[in-house]
């Protein structure tokens, strides 16, 4: 069965300077491949976080993603700024062999509204 990526919140509002959690769960870890968060769509989309060991300032995972059966890929964004506003997508990839990883499923997106303090 095809993996499903669920982002339960269509939108979240957060005051500038505060933190917010963007929720994402998957129904399967197969086919093997990373999960990444992006802001925006298409050619201009921006990589926000990747669950592949790199460090991303202000962003961290919420659950224990080193669990071998972890299905929760939610993230916490700290010290939110107005520039963080936009729609965030949780995306499951299938690892490529000699080619880049292939996107196989995306969540429906969560729009982040940043409120002035």
């Amino acid at each position: 069965t095809e993996v499903k990526v669920t982002q339960p919140e269509k939108s979240v509002s957060v005051a500038a300077g505060d933190s917010t959690i963007l929720n994402c769960t998957v129904t399967s870890l197969l086919p093997v491949g990373p999960i990444r968060w992006y802001r925006g769509v298409g050619q201009s989309r921006l990589l926000i976080y990747s669950f592949t060991g790199e460090h991303f300032p202000r962003i961290r995972n919420v659950s224990d993603t080193t669990k071998r059966n972890n299905m929760d890929f939610s993230i916490r964004i700290s010290n939110v700024t107005p520039e963080d506003a936009g729609t965030y997508y949780c995306v499951k990839f299938q690892r490529g062999s000699s080619e880049p990883d292939t996107e196989i499923q995306s969540g429906g997106g969560t729009e982040v509204y940043v409120l002035a303090k």
Epitope: L29, L30, P31, V32, P34, F51, T52, G53, D64, T65, T66, K67, R68, N69, N70, R95, S97, S98
Partner: antibody, heavy 117, light 108 residues
Framework: DVQLVESGGGVVRPGESLRLSCAVS????????MSWVRQAPGKGLEWVSG???????YYVDSVKGRFTISRDNSKNTLYLQVNSLTAEDTAIYYC???????????WGLGTLVTVSS | SYELTQPPSVSVSPGQTARITCSGG??????YAWYQQKPGQAPVTVIH???KRPSDIPERFSGSSSGTTVTLTISGVQAEDEADYYC???????????FGGGTKLTVL
Amino acid sequence: DVQLVESGGGVVRPGESLRLSCAVSGFRFSSYAMSWVRQAPGKGLEWVSGISSGGDTYYVDSVKGRFTISRDNSKNTLYLQVNSLTAEDTAIYYCARETWNHLFDYWGLGTLVTVSS
Amino acid sequence: SYELTQPPSVSVSPGQTARITCSGGDYYSTYYAWYQQKPGQAPVTVIHSDDKRPSDIPERFSGSSSGTTVTLTISGVQAEDEADYYCGGYDGRTYINTFGGGTKLTVL
């Protein structure tokens, strides 16, 4: 520099127990899953057990119920309690740091466990 | 579970290219790595995540995959590359790590 230093090996009789330790430095231990891998004399590598950063545990079938992996994130130390030892458990036991997808990137030098009557 | 199969030995002359294969995993559910072990020493990771080389590993080491076979390629083999090489796999279906039997690389 990443360092993994095992200790606690020795010569024991069948049925006896040992506690192996792996002291780590050079990285944020609490963020990584860890594993124990063993190598019998003149043989290949065998994965024994793994533990997530939060303490979820995994074992190869042959050691389930006899071996217990644990960690103390405050002491930067990984443990393997080995009980009811048999001659087949004679091996060098290595601790290894896991990558995001549960392969291994850094290894300790190993500690030798010899089970002999 | 699954078994990873490697050739017991591979021989190559210095400066030539060595290829060590590993088969038996399920590409849908398995990630691969290659580990080098010299006599009396601990293993060293030369490739992980199919084709990722740690920063301290020479560029002559590379990994690739095709179907259910993964390959470690050592270009311009040097005498110091003589060692046992183990293919390792992590199966996301069973949550288990497996190793191949090892391949002894001899530099003639």
